[in-house]
């Protein structure tokens, strides 16, 4: 069993290395920024990311492209729930520095949890998406 788990871990590692999770990150950032825009946040605030949603994109245009590609990538993990969880964790880690404040972080986490379901995939049962140490946030 230990041998099988080791092989599973290796397979997951190589799957993660070949996955392009950027479209998922973009899709989620678009979602939470669109929500914020409707609450009066300045949609023209600058961003470090060359592919971060433009004010035009944030209104929904181009969003389906990120979602479609994101779902294709997550679909590759459908047979391995633990690996799917690791992919979600990686998305959370990659974006944590770009999330401004606790509220945005919680919102991103909430959208991230819903992502597999949004793609018509099974969501991992237990998946810890907490980035900083301290209280663990259970799936």
């Amino acid at each position: 069993r230990q041998q099988w788990e080791l092989q599973g871990d290796r397979r997951c590692q190589s799957q993660l290395e070949r996955a392009n999770l950027r479209p998922c990150e973009q899709h989620l950032m678009q979602k939470i920024q669109r929500d914020e825009d409707s609450y009066g946040r300045d949609p023209y605030s600058p961003s470090q990311d060359p592919y971060s949603p433009s004010p035009y994109d944030r209104r929904g245009a181009g969003s389906s492209q990120h979602q479609e590609r994101c779902c294709n990538e997550l679909n590759e993990f459908e047979n391995n729930q633990r690996c799917m969880c690791e992919a979600l964790q990686q998305i959370m880690e990659n974006q944590s520095d770009r999330l401004q404040g606790r509220q945005q972080e919680q919102q991103f986490k909430r959208e991230l949890r819903n992502l597999p379901q949004q793609c018509g995939l099974r969501a991992p049962q237990r998946c810890d998406l907490e980035v900083e140490s301290g209280g663990r946030d259970r799936y």
């Epitope: 950027r22 479209p23 592919y51 994109d57 181009g62 969003s63 389906s64 492209q65 679909n75």
Partner: antibody, heavy 123, light 108 residues
Framework: EVQLVESGGGLVKPGGSLRLSCAAS????????MNWVRQAPGKGLEWVSS????????YYADSVKGRFTISRDNAKNSLHLQMNSLRDADTAVYYC????????????????WGNGTTVIVSS | EIVLTQSPGTLSLSPGERATLSCRAS???????LVWYQQKPGQAPRLLIY???TRATGIPDRFSGSGSGTDFTLTISRLEPEDFAVYYC?????????FGQGTKLEIK
Amino acid sequence: EVQLVESGGGLVKPGGSLRLSCAASGFIFSDYNMNWVRQAPGKGLEWVSSITRSSRTIYYADSVKGRFTISRDNAKNSLHLQMNSLRDADTAVYYCAREDFDVSTGPYYMDVWGNGTTVIVSS
Amino acid sequence: EIVLTQSPGTLSLSPGERATLSCRASQSVSNMFLVWYQQKPGQAPRLLIYGASTRATGIPDRFSGSGSGTDFTLTISRLEPEDFAVYYCQQNGNSPYTFGQGTKLEIK
């Protein structure tokens, strides 16, 4: 050397079938999404079909949907396109292309192409 | 389906001149999913630009891509004899992954 070599093209009558193959070498085939793109004589490029690394997501152009089937065999480093109910309009050079992405920023692109195999549908 | 319309259909210029090729989408395309390819007669297409503005490995810096939303541009700052070819834009964000009809760049 990274290489894609298509084969299986030829002359076929309308309504007939043909199976194209693409042999990959010089890279880890199972790490990449793959595509078929075609070009009719004197015309532009037309995307035909794509398949993800583990064959879990497959797409087709409307013009071939229900007639063409894309598949891959990662153990044999090969990509296939089964073409049924062929029409005159399917006459083209068929290219096999590897899809990669920029690891740091995410954009996808087809960076390696075969030289193509010619399919002629004519009575 | 996202339709990409390239203009002009044919562009006649001399070596040393600047070429501006346009690609217009029927609906917004995220920069992440806009690609440019070059094709010479009897050859397979060659990747030029991806992500709307990033040059592929080995592509000279006289080639540049720009634009966003529905309007994208490929610019060749100073044409070299080997640049005369057909250029295609493609979107690969939404299936079907459509190509533009191409712009033929010919020697004047």
